[in-house]
Protein backbone atom coordinates (compact mmCIF):
# COMPACT_ATOMS: atom_id res chain seq x y z
CA UNK A 1 0.00 0.00 0.00
CA UNK A 2 0.93 3.50 -0.95
CA UNK A 3 2.81 5.58 2.26
CA UNK A 4 0.32 7.75 3.91
CA UNK A 5 2.76 10.84 2.85
CA UNK A 6 2.28 9.81 -0.88
CA UNK A 7 -1.69 10.32 -0.40
CA UNK A 8 -1.16 13.56 1.62
CA UNK A 9 -0.72 17.12 -0.56
CA UNK A 10 1.79 18.52 1.79
CA UNK A 11 4.36 20.48 -0.10
CA UNK A 12 7.75 20.70 0.88
CA UNK A 13 9.49 24.30 0.53
CA UNK A 14 13.31 24.67 0.83
CA UNK A 15 14.36 27.13 2.86
CA UNK A 16 18.35 26.62 2.86
CA UNK A 17 21.48 24.55 3.67
CA UNK A 18 21.77 24.06 7.37
CA UNK A 19 24.84 22.08 7.63
CA UNK A 20 27.62 21.88 5.79
CA UNK A 21 30.37 18.81 5.10
CA UNK A 22 29.32 16.41 8.21
CA UNK A 23 30.07 13.13 8.98
CA UNK A 24 27.60 10.34 10.13
CA UNK A 25 28.63 8.17 13.07
CA UNK A 26 26.33 5.20 13.79
CA UNK A 27 26.06 4.11 17.72
CA UNK A 28 29.23 1.23 17.09
CA UNK A 29 31.16 4.17 16.05
CA UNK A 30 31.11 3.18 12.17
CA UNK A 31 31.32 6.43 10.00
CA UNK A 32 29.40 5.88 6.70
CA UNK A 33 31.42 5.43 3.71
CA UNK A 34 30.77 4.57 -0.25
CA UNK A 35 30.30 1.71 -1.38
CA UNK A 36 29.48 2.20 -4.83
CA UNK A 37 28.06 4.55 -7.44
CA UNK A 38 24.71 3.67 -5.80
CA UNK A 39 25.08 2.80 -2.34
CA UNK A 40 26.40 3.61 1.43
CA UNK A 41 27.84 1.29 3.85
CA UNK A 42 29.66 2.00 6.94
CA UNK A 43 32.80 0.84 8.47
CA UNK A 44 34.86 1.61 11.48
CA UNK A 45 37.76 4.26 9.99
CA UNK A 46 40.89 5.00 11.74
CA UNK A 47 41.28 8.10 8.96
CA UNK A 48 37.71 10.07 8.99
CA UNK A 49 39.04 11.70 5.63
CA UNK A 50 37.76 8.15 3.91
CA UNK A 51 33.92 9.00 5.03
CA UNK A 52 31.48 10.49 3.08
CA UNK A 53 30.71 14.50 3.90
CA UNK A 54 26.71 15.50 3.80
CA UNK A 55 25.66 18.43 3.40
CA UNK A 56 22.07 19.06 5.07
CA UNK A 57 19.26 21.59 3.35
CA UNK A 58 15.66 22.49 5.20
CA UNK A 59 12.33 22.26 3.88
CA UNK A 60 9.25 23.73 5.26
CA UNK A 61 6.02 22.17 4.70
CA UNK A 62 2.84 23.56 3.56
CA UNK A 63 1.05 22.54 6.84
CA UNK A 64 2.22 23.89 10.02
CA UNK A 65 4.75 21.50 11.13
CA UNK A 66 5.96 20.21 14.19
CA UNK A 67 9.51 18.29 12.21
CA UNK A 68 12.55 19.23 10.98
CA UNK A 69 12.09 18.57 7.41
CA UNK A 70 15.83 18.08 5.89
CA UNK A 71 17.36 16.63 2.29
CA UNK A 72 20.80 15.07 2.62
CA UNK A 73 23.55 15.55 -0.39
CA UNK A 74 26.70 14.31 -0.62
CA UNK A 75 29.17 17.61 -0.11
CA UNK A 76 30.35 18.61 -3.68
CA UNK A 77 28.08 16.60 -5.50
CA UNK A 78 24.79 16.07 -7.06
CA UNK A 79 23.75 13.16 -5.57
CA UNK A 80 21.03 12.91 -2.75
CA UNK A 81 20.20 10.42 -0.23
CA UNK A 82 16.99 8.82 -1.35
CA UNK A 83 14.45 6.17 0.40
CA UNK A 84 13.51 3.06 -1.24
CA UNK A 85 11.47 0.25 1.19
CA UNK A 86 12.17 -1.12 4.30
CA UNK A 87 15.36 -3.47 4.20
CA UNK A 88 16.09 -1.98 1.11
CA UNK A 89 19.38 0.34 0.26
CA UNK A 90 18.75 3.86 0.34
CA UNK A 91 19.89 4.89 -3.42
CA UNK A 92 22.32 7.68 -4.22
CA UNK A 93 19.91 9.90 -7.08
CA UNK A 94 21.63 12.25 -9.43
CA UNK A 95 19.99 15.65 -9.82
CA UNK A 96 21.02 19.06 -11.28
CA UNK A 97 20.11 20.88 -8.20
CA UNK A 98 18.45 20.54 -4.78
CA UNK A 99 15.03 20.00 -5.65
CA UNK A 100 13.08 23.88 -4.77
CA UNK A 101 9.54 21.88 -4.20
CA UNK A 102 8.89 18.62 -3.04
CA UNK A 103 5.87 16.86 -2.95
CA UNK A 104 3.74 13.25 -3.37
CA UNK A 105 6.18 10.25 -4.70
CA UNK A 106 9.62 12.62 -4.35
CA UNK A 107 9.10 12.52 -0.57
CA UNK A 108 11.42 9.60 -0.97
CA UNK A 109 13.84 12.50 -0.64
CA UNK A 110 13.26 14.11 2.36
CA UNK A 111 13.70 13.33 5.82
CA UNK A 112 11.96 14.29 9.14
CA UNK A 113 15.51 15.01 11.62
CA UNK A 114 15.11 14.12 15.54
CA UNK A 115 17.71 15.00 17.50
CA UNK A 116 17.74 13.66 21.58
CA UNK A 117 21.18 14.39 23.19
CA UNK A 118 24.00 13.44 20.85
CA UNK A 119 21.75 10.73 19.37
CA UNK A 120 20.48 12.18 15.86
CA UNK A 121 17.77 9.71 13.78
CA UNK A 122 16.10 10.71 9.78
CA UNK A 123 12.92 9.04 9.56
CA UNK A 124 11.65 8.77 5.91
CA UNK A 125 8.65 11.45 5.06
CA UNK A 126 7.47 8.75 2.45
CA UNK A 127 7.71 5.50 5.31
CA UNK A 128 7.28 7.49 8.71
CA UNK A 129 7.83 4.21 10.60
CA UNK A 130 11.21 3.75 8.77
CA UNK A 131 14.85 5.63 9.44
CA UNK A 132 18.23 5.23 8.31
CA UNK A 133 19.99 2.65 9.04
CA UNK A 134 22.86 0.76 9.69
CA UNK A 135 22.96 -2.97 9.36
CA UNK A 136 26.01 -5.56 9.81
CA UNK A 137 27.39 -6.81 6.42
CA UNK A 138 24.88 -4.33 4.56
CA UNK A 139 24.72 -1.31 3.00
CA UNK A 140 22.83 1.56 4.94
CA UNK A 141 19.22 1.37 4.18
CA UNK A 142 15.37 1.88 5.70
CA UNK A 143 14.99 -0.09 8.85
CA UNK A 144 12.05 0.19 11.72
CA UNK A 145 14.54 -0.42 14.33
CA UNK A 146 16.93 -3.19 15.87
CA UNK A 147 18.63 -5.23 14.67
CA UNK A 148 19.77 -2.43 12.53
CA UNK A 149 21.34 0.83 14.21
CA UNK A 150 18.93 3.74 13.68
CA UNK A 151 21.20 6.89 15.82
CA UNK A 152 24.27 8.96 14.63
CA UNK A 153 26.02 10.90 15.80
CA UNK A 154 26.87 14.41 13.88
CA UNK A 155 30.85 14.92 13.50
CA UNK A 156 31.06 18.72 12.31
CA UNK A 157 34.25 21.16 11.34
CA UNK A 158 36.33 18.03 10.17
CA UNK A 159 39.05 19.41 8.44
CA UNK B 1 26.87 15.30 27.73
CA UNK B 2 25.72 19.27 27.63
CA UNK B 3 25.38 21.00 31.00
CA UNK B 4 23.26 24.46 31.37
CA UNK B 5 24.74 27.18 33.73
CA UNK B 6 22.49 30.23 34.19
CA UNK B 7 23.40 33.17 35.86
CA UNK B 8 22.64 34.93 38.96
CA UNK B 9 19.90 36.14 40.67
CA UNK B 10 18.99 39.34 39.93
CA UNK B 11 16.50 41.86 41.98
CA UNK B 12 14.82 44.12 39.71
CA UNK B 13 12.79 47.26 39.91
CA UNK B 14 9.17 47.82 37.94
CA UNK B 15 9.52 48.96 34.39
CA UNK B 16 13.56 47.86 34.21
CA UNK B 17 14.32 45.01 32.13
CA UNK B 18 16.68 41.48 32.93
CA UNK B 19 18.64 39.71 30.68
CA UNK B 20 19.08 36.08 32.17
CA UNK B 21 22.28 33.84 30.41
CA UNK B 22 22.19 30.32 29.91
CA UNK B 23 25.77 28.89 29.47
CA UNK B 24 26.36 25.28 27.30
CA UNK B 25 29.39 23.31 28.70
CA UNK B 26 30.50 20.23 27.00
CA UNK B 27 28.46 21.36 23.83
CA UNK B 28 27.05 23.65 21.57
CA UNK B 29 23.22 24.42 21.17
CA UNK B 30 24.22 23.73 17.30
CA UNK B 31 21.22 21.29 16.65
CA UNK B 32 19.21 21.84 19.00
CA UNK B 33 16.16 23.66 20.22
CA UNK B 34 16.08 25.99 23.18
CA UNK B 35 12.76 26.64 25.48
CA UNK B 36 12.80 29.21 28.26
CA UNK B 37 10.71 28.32 30.87
CA UNK B 38 9.70 29.86 34.37
CA UNK B 39 8.06 28.91 37.66
CA UNK B 40 6.03 31.42 39.90
CA UNK B 41 6.38 31.30 43.96
CA UNK B 42 4.60 27.55 44.32
CA UNK B 43 3.58 27.51 40.81
CA UNK B 44 3.88 25.47 37.88
CA UNK B 45 5.73 25.76 34.87
CA UNK B 46 5.15 28.00 32.10
CA UNK B 47 6.50 28.08 28.85
CA UNK B 48 7.87 31.97 27.33
CA UNK B 49 9.55 31.41 24.54
CA UNK B 50 12.07 29.62 22.63
CA UNK B 51 14.96 29.64 19.71
CA UNK B 52 15.93 26.82 16.95
CA UNK B 53 19.31 28.75 16.57
CA UNK B 54 20.16 26.82 13.44
CA UNK B 55 17.30 28.09 11.83
CA UNK B 56 17.50 31.61 13.46
CA UNK B 57 13.64 30.87 14.59
CA UNK B 58 12.65 32.58 17.49
CA UNK B 59 8.90 31.36 19.10
CA UNK B 60 6.99 33.75 21.92
CA UNK B 61 4.44 33.12 23.95
CA UNK B 62 1.49 35.13 23.24
CA UNK B 63 1.80 37.00 26.63
CA UNK B 64 5.43 38.11 26.39
CA UNK B 65 5.03 38.64 22.93
CA UNK B 66 6.22 42.40 23.33
CA UNK B 67 8.57 42.46 26.07
CA UNK B 68 11.03 39.13 25.75
CA UNK B 69 14.12 39.04 23.33
CA UNK B 70 15.55 35.32 22.97
CA UNK B 71 19.12 35.48 21.52
CA UNK B 72 21.98 33.05 21.09
CA UNK B 73 25.96 34.14 20.31
CA UNK B 74 27.81 33.14 17.46
CA UNK B 75 29.34 30.43 19.22
CA UNK B 76 26.18 28.95 19.96
CA UNK B 77 27.27 28.23 23.56
CA UNK B 78 25.18 30.78 25.54
CA UNK B 79 21.73 31.83 25.05
CA UNK B 80 20.12 35.01 25.95
CA UNK B 81 16.74 35.32 27.77
CA UNK B 82 15.71 38.95 28.17
CA UNK B 83 12.08 40.34 30.05
CA UNK B 84 11.42 43.96 29.51
CA UNK B 85 8.88 46.21 31.27
CA UNK B 86 8.55 44.37 34.18
CA UNK B 87 6.03 43.65 36.84
CA UNK B 88 5.75 42.01 40.31
CA UNK B 89 4.24 39.27 38.91
CA UNK B 90 7.52 38.24 36.98
CA UNK B 91 8.85 37.44 39.76
CA UNK B 92 9.86 34.03 39.02
CA UNK B 93 12.73 31.39 38.86
CA UNK B 94 13.88 31.51 35.28
CA UNK B 95 14.60 28.25 33.63
CA UNK B 96 16.41 27.26 30.23
CA UNK B 97 16.49 23.78 28.43
CA UNK B 98 17.80 22.06 25.61
CA UNK B 99 18.52 19.01 24.33
CA UNK B 100 16.73 17.69 21.64
CA UNK B 101 15.28 20.03 18.06
CA UNK B 102 11.79 19.74 19.54
CA UNK B 103 10.50 21.81 22.05
CA UNK B 104 11.36 19.74 25.25
CA UNK B 105 14.11 19.90 28.27
CA UNK B 106 16.27 17.08 28.07
CA UNK B 107 19.08 19.08 29.59
CA UNK B 108 17.83 21.90 32.34
CA UNK B 109 19.81 25.05 33.51
CA UNK B 110 19.54 25.61 37.73
CA UNK B 111 17.12 28.09 37.23
CA UNK B 112 17.70 32.24 38.07
CA UNK B 113 15.34 33.72 40.75
CA UNK B 114 14.40 37.10 39.50
CA UNK B 115 12.60 39.28 42.31
CA UNK B 116 10.70 42.23 40.82
CA UNK B 117 9.91 44.65 43.88
CA UNK B 118 9.97 48.04 44.86
CA UNK C 1 -3.83 27.28 22.31
CA UNK C 2 -3.81 23.16 23.56
CA UNK C 3 -5.09 23.09 27.63
CA UNK C 4 -3.43 20.18 29.03
CA UNK C 5 -5.16 19.13 32.51
CA UNK C 6 -3.43 16.20 35.15
CA UNK C 7 -5.38 14.30 37.32
CA UNK C 8 -5.16 13.91 40.27
CA UNK C 9 -3.86 17.85 41.71
CA UNK C 10 -2.50 15.54 44.92
CA UNK C 11 -1.78 11.69 44.59
CA UNK C 12 -0.55 10.08 48.06
CA UNK C 13 0.22 6.20 47.53
CA UNK C 14 2.20 3.94 50.18
CA UNK C 15 5.55 2.60 49.55
CA UNK C 16 5.57 -0.40 47.03
CA UNK C 17 2.09 0.63 45.17
CA UNK C 18 1.12 1.49 41.91
CA UNK C 19 0.99 5.54 40.84
CA UNK C 20 -1.07 6.41 38.30
CA UNK C 21 -1.11 9.93 36.93
CA UNK C 22 -3.42 11.21 33.74
CA UNK C 23 -3.06 14.08 31.77
CA UNK C 24 -5.69 14.93 28.75
CA UNK C 25 -5.17 17.34 25.94
CA UNK C 26 -7.69 19.45 24.54
CA UNK C 27 -6.90 18.40 21.09
CA UNK C 28 -4.79 15.42 19.70
CA UNK C 29 -1.13 15.67 20.00
CA UNK C 30 -0.58 12.48 17.48
CA UNK C 31 0.73 13.74 14.49
CA UNK C 32 0.14 12.22 11.88
CA UNK C 33 3.10 12.39 9.22
CA UNK C 34 5.28 10.16 11.52
CA UNK C 35 2.52 8.85 14.14
CA UNK C 36 4.25 10.24 17.06
CA UNK C 37 2.71 11.78 20.66
CA UNK C 38 4.15 14.88 21.13
CA UNK C 39 4.32 14.47 24.76
CA UNK C 40 6.33 14.46 27.62
CA UNK C 41 6.48 13.83 31.34
CA UNK C 42 8.83 15.47 33.94
CA UNK C 43 9.72 14.92 37.41
CA UNK C 44 10.28 18.11 39.55
CA UNK C 45 11.48 17.97 42.94
CA UNK C 46 11.67 20.68 45.79
CA UNK C 47 14.25 23.12 45.03
CA UNK C 48 15.41 21.47 41.72
CA UNK C 49 14.60 22.00 37.90
CA UNK C 50 12.55 19.59 36.00
CA UNK C 51 14.25 16.64 34.95
CA UNK C 52 12.63 14.64 31.90
CA UNK C 53 11.27 11.14 32.21
CA UNK C 54 9.42 10.46 28.94
CA UNK C 55 9.37 12.01 25.68
CA UNK C 56 7.32 10.94 22.65
CA UNK C 57 4.68 9.91 25.54
CA UNK C 58 6.02 6.16 26.30
CA UNK C 59 9.99 6.69 25.57
CA UNK C 60 11.71 6.14 28.74
CA UNK C 61 14.79 8.67 29.17
CA UNK C 62 17.96 6.87 29.47
CA UNK C 63 19.05 6.53 33.48
CA UNK C 64 15.46 6.38 34.59
CA UNK C 65 14.25 3.61 36.37
CA UNK C 66 11.99 0.85 34.39
CA UNK C 67 9.80 1.54 37.23
CA UNK C 68 7.95 4.23 35.32
CA UNK C 69 6.50 4.41 32.15
CA UNK C 70 4.17 6.64 29.60
CA UNK C 71 1.24 5.48 27.42
CA UNK C 72 -1.43 6.62 26.27
CA UNK C 73 -2.34 8.36 22.07
CA UNK C 74 -3.91 10.91 20.95
CA UNK C 75 -5.68 13.35 23.65
CA UNK C 76 -5.37 10.86 26.74
CA UNK C 77 -1.94 9.91 28.63
CA UNK C 78 -0.70 8.22 31.66
CA UNK C 79 2.54 8.34 33.93
CA UNK C 80 2.81 5.13 36.00
CA UNK C 81 5.16 4.29 38.45
CA UNK C 82 5.03 0.88 39.00
CA UNK C 83 6.32 0.34 42.73
CA UNK C 84 6.74 3.65 44.20
CA UNK C 85 10.46 4.35 46.23
CA UNK C 86 10.40 6.96 48.79
CA UNK C 87 12.29 9.23 46.13
CA UNK C 88 9.56 9.25 43.97
CA UNK C 89 8.17 12.31 45.84
CA UNK C 90 7.96 15.32 43.49
CA UNK C 91 5.48 16.80 41.43
CA UNK C 92 4.88 15.82 38.18
CA UNK C 93 4.28 17.64 35.03
CA UNK C 94 3.22 16.27 31.37
CA UNK C 95 4.02 18.84 28.56
CA UNK C 96 2.92 18.86 24.67
CA UNK C 97 5.52 19.74 22.10
CA UNK C 98 2.85 19.64 19.11
CA UNK C 99 2.06 22.97 18.79
CA UNK C 100 3.04 26.50 19.63
CA UNK C 101 2.42 27.95 22.23
CA UNK C 102 4.04 24.96 24.12
CA UNK C 103 1.83 23.70 27.02
CA UNK C 104 2.19 22.32 30.44
CA UNK C 105 -0.24 20.41 32.52
CA UNK C 106 -0.96 22.29 36.73
CA UNK C 107 1.25 19.51 38.18
CA UNK C 108 0.47 16.57 40.14
CA UNK C 109 2.09 16.10 44.14
CA UNK C 110 2.77 12.91 44.85
CA UNK C 111 3.86 12.17 47.99
CA UNK C 112 3.89 9.04 50.38
CA UNK C 113 0.94 7.81 52.13
Known amino acids: SAPFSFLSNVKYNFMRIIKYEFILNDALNQSIIRANDQYLTAAALHNLDEAVKFDMGAYKSSKDDAKITVILRISKTQLYVTAQDEDQPVLLKEMPEIPKTITGSETNLLFFWETHGTKNYFTSVAHPNLFIATKQDYWVCLAGGPPSITDFQILENQA | QVQLVQSGAEVKKPGSSVKVSCKASGGRFTNYAILWVRQAPGQGLQWLGGIIPIFDETDHAQDFQDRLTITVDESMTTAYMELSSLRPEDTAIYYC???????????WGQGTLVTVSS | DIVMTQSPDFLAVSLGERATINCKSS????????????LAWYQQKAGQPPKLLIY???TRESGVPDRFSGSGSATDFTLTISSLQAEDVAVYYCQQYYSLPITFGQGTRLEIK
Open chain 2, 97 to 107: ATGSNSYYGLY
Open chain 3, 27 to 38: QSVLYSSDNKNY
Open chain 3, 56 to 58: WAS
